[in-house]
Interface confidence: low
């Protein structure tokens, strides 16, 4: 029978769609050689046994957005071809035990968003061909065990978004197949040992966003295939040490949202595809010496908003490829002149909402591909002489809301930001906080005209001026050996601002340091 | 400037084998997923395969799954794509692309394109 | 697998016209893990290989005129071209990278009226 029901579309009479809130009960007469069935969004509560029953080569059926609350046990009788089964967005609260008893080649089965608050353990059991199981946005309070025992092939299951508490240990230990894990949105506050340990082909497990406080040190280590493990967004206070060290093929690692306080050496061992590092919005008050000294491939590596106060000298030890590193929103009061030492290709850094008073004149010296250096809203009264003279690409200087000192000694950063004005954006130009005459006026003044001595910085510098480079023509270079007659008064003469204060963009991150 | 420069393309008859090549500069090779996407004559466009950081991270579209091969050489920051067992229906133009984001996994767009080699299947 | 599906498949349109293109997938595109929906826009001009537009559904690429914005979320997703002008004329694409096989739509031609 070619027809096709009267509220429905029938595409070359394989193709069924029935949408609308007009259809209140399952269409008919079906066309009986219907391949695949969508039914969105209607009002139909209710599938009976028998409308299914001539329409045997139906290979999809998708019926989601409806009003679904009951399946009579046998509505699936006859659907062997059926590969597809989506019954996502319903209400269903219960499914019978053997609803799925005469579709067993199915290879995916959409659960998701309905009111399950149960699942027999015997209700997936012939489902060896199944491929990926969507259980997210339910409320199953517990998984039992055996539910998924003979799901063999299966390389993607979602629970997410379910509320339940905990797991057994043996839930997955027959998925050896499964690629893709995601328990998401739950309340798991502890994951046994053991739980992922048959999980051997796991490519993404996703556990962010649930209650987890501790992770077993050998939690993953059987989930060498690991590319993408997300941990964000829990209560884990500690990392035990090797909790990482059996994942040669992870490159990404999300973190951030947790209560993590400090980091132990080696605790990310080696994960040599790690590129990005997430970290942000955690307790970390210190790092030591060789944190992250195994992640030599790493890239991107976001500490911002921690309660930072101490990096160690060589906590950046073997970041040898770090292109972007955000430290904003700490408590940082000063740095070690060698900190970013080993950061060769570093590009990047946002220092920005710190309590940094100085820096040390060395503290870029190794680092001479910088981009962007972002250091607004700290408690810099000066900078050292020559301290950004070798970086040659940088691009985007921030130097805005902090405590310039205008006196004497700010010569030398004064006339360099004149000749490298182009590098300090267009947001938001540094102002003079002292001495009180001077308060509010630009640092960079087009005219300071007082004779005078001529004056050193405030620290003898390891590189002895603030040069201009080739990429900005309209810069001169200045030397150090630049005679320079100021007065030595406390207050300045003649000043003439370049333009009105800009409004202010406190943040003035990267993309990927806006975590 | 990223470039991507594809070679290889041409006329082959039916069950016969091609390997299309691209060279990428102006970017660290390395640091992205890469991918192949065709486009049959006067149609839309088709994701063929992506490649990862690594030969073990490969996706292909059903269509070509078992008769294509795509592979890196990171040292020479060239793409590959060894098509064997043609059929008429891979005739179209193939444009080697890069993925957006560096170190990150192949879930994201494609941002790049070559200019595109045009592969004939005929007798 | 994901399908794409665009509609109109062509419009003819007028320079300063307001445009939209619309693209539905069979299943949603926004993942909850990142809430970022995975959905790219692309134009391409006869002869001429595709150009990124619009990623992350809304995200305009640099360099890309802002009469062109991206919008929606789950599985509608709208390109809308603002005030359309002389060079605009070409063929648009979505496509979803939520999961391999990464698929595109068919496709929605822009013509002059």
């Known amino acids: 029978y070619y027809g096709c029901p009267s509220e429905c579309t029938c595409s070359r009479a394989s193709q069924v769609e029935c949408t609308g809130a007009q259809i209140v009960a399952m269409p008919s007469p079906l066309p009986w050689n219907a391949m695949s069935l969508q039914i969105l969004n209607t009002h139909i509560t209710e599938l009976p046994e028998d409308k299914f029953l001539n329409i045997s080569a139906l290979i999809a059926l998708k019926m989601e957005k409806n009003e679904l609350a009951n399946i009579m046990p046998g509505a699936f009788r006859n659907l062997g071809s059926l590969r597809h089964l989506s019954l996502a967005n319903n209400k269903l609260k219960n499914l019978p035990v053997r609803l799925f008893q005469d579709v067993n080649n199915l290879e995916t089965l959409l659960l998701s968003n309905n009111q399950l608050v149960q699942i027999q353990p015997a209700q997936f059991s012939q489902f060896s061909n199944l491929k990926e199981l969507q259980l997210y946005g339910n409320n199953l309070e517990y998984i039992p065990e055996g539910v998924f025992d003979h799901l063999v092939g299966l390389t993607k299951l979602n629970l997410g978004n379910n509320g339940f508490t905990h797991l057994s240990p043996r839930v997955f230990q027959h998925l050896g197949n499964l690629q893709v894990l995601r328990l998401y949105e739950n309340r798991l506050s502890d994951i046994p040992m053991g739980t992922f340990d048959a999980l051997g082909n796991l490519q993404e497990l996703a556990l962010q966003e649930n209650q987890i406080g501790t992770l077993s040190p050998g939690l993953f280590h059987n989930n060498r295939n690991l590319q993408r493990l997300y941990l964000s967004n829990n209560h884990i206070s500690h990392l035990p040490p090797g909790i990482f060290m059996q994942l040669p093929h992870l490159n990404k690692l999300t973190l951030f949202g947790n209560s993590l306080k400090e980091l132990s050496p080696g605790v990310f061992g080696p994960m040599p595809n790690l590129r990005e590092l997430w970290l942000y919005n955690n307790h970390i008050t210190s790092l030591p010496d060789n944190a992250f000294s195994h992640l030599n491939q790493l890239q991107v590596l976001i500490l911002s908003h921690n309660q930072l106060s101490y990096i160690s000298p060589g906590a950046f030890n073997g970041l040898t490829n770090l292109r972007e590193l955000s430290l904003h929103t700490n408590a940082l009061q000063d740095l070690d002149g060698n900190v970013f030492r080993s950061l060769a290709n570093l590009r990047n850094v946002s220092l920005q909402n710190n309590r940094l008073r100085q820096l040390p004149g060395s503290i870029f010296a190794n680092v001479n591909g910088l981009m962007t250096i972002q250091l607004q809203n700290n408690n810099l009264e000066n900078l050292p002489l020559g301290i950004f003279d070798h970086l040659g690409n940088l691009c985007e200087l921030r130097l805005y809301d902090n405590p310039w000192r205008c006196d004497s000694n700010i010569l030398p950063l004064h006339d360099w930001l004149i000749l490298n004005r182009a590098r300090l954006g267009t947001d938001t130009l540094p102002v003079c906080s002292s001495p009180a005459s001077v308060r509010g006026q630009s640092l960079v003044i087009i005219n300071v005209n007082f004779p005078g001595p001529s004056v050193q910085g405030p620290e003898t510098p390891e590189v002895s001026s603030y040069p201009d480079t080739s990429s900005y023509p309209d810069s001169t270079s200045i030397s150090s050996t630049t005679e320079i007659t100021r007065s030595t008064d406390d207050d300045y003469t003649d000043l003439n601002t370049i333009e009105p204060i800009d409004d202010r963009n406190t943040w003035g991150m990267t993309d990927a340091q806006s975590g | 400037e990223v470039q991507l420069v594809e070679s290889g393309g041409g006329l082959v008859q039916p069950g016969g084998s091609l390997r299309l090549s691209c060279a990428a500069s102006?970017?660290?090779?390395?640091?992205?997923?890469m991918a192949w996407v065709r486009q049959a004559p006067g149609k839309g466009l088709e994701w063929v395969a992506s490649?990862?950081?690594?030969?073990?991270?490969?996706y292909y579209a059903d269509s070509v799954k078992g008769r294509f091969t795509i592979s890196r050489d990171d040292s020479k920051s060239t793409l590959y794509l060894q098509m064997n067992s043609l059929r008429a229906e891979d005739t179209a133009v193939y444009y080697c692309?890069?993925?957006?984001?560096?170190?990150?996994?192949?879930?994201?767009?494609?941002?790049?394109w070559g200019q595109g080699t045009l592969v004939t299947v005929s007798s | 697998d994901i399908q794409m599906t665009q509609s109109p498949s062509s419009l003819s349109a007028s320079v300063g016209d307001r445009v939209t293109i619309t693209c539905k997938s069979s299943?949603?595109?926004?993942?909850?893990?990142?809430?970022?929906?995975?959905l790219a826009w692309y134009q391409q001009k006869p002869g001429k290989s595709p150009k990124l537009l619009i990623y992350?559904?809304?995200t305009r690429q640099s360099g890309v005129p802002d009469r062109f914005s991206g919008s929606g979320s789950g599985t509608d997703f709208t390109l809308t071209i603002s005030s359309l002008q002389p060079e605009d004329f070409a063929t648009y694409y979505c496509?979803?990278?939520?999961?391999?096989?990464?698929?595109f739509g068919q496709g929605t031609k822009v013509e002059i009226k």
């Open positions: 692309t890069r993925h957006g984001v560096s170190y990150y996994s192949g879930d994201n767009w494609f941002a790049y």
């Open positions: 102006g970017f660290t090779f390395r640091d992205y997923y």
């Open positions: 490649i990862g950081f690594d030969e073990s991270r490969t």
């Open positions: 299943q949603g595109l926004l993942y909850s893990g990142d809430q970022k929906n995975y």
């Open positions: 992350w559904a809304s």
């Open positions: 496509q979803q990278y939520y999961d391999p096989p990464y698929t």
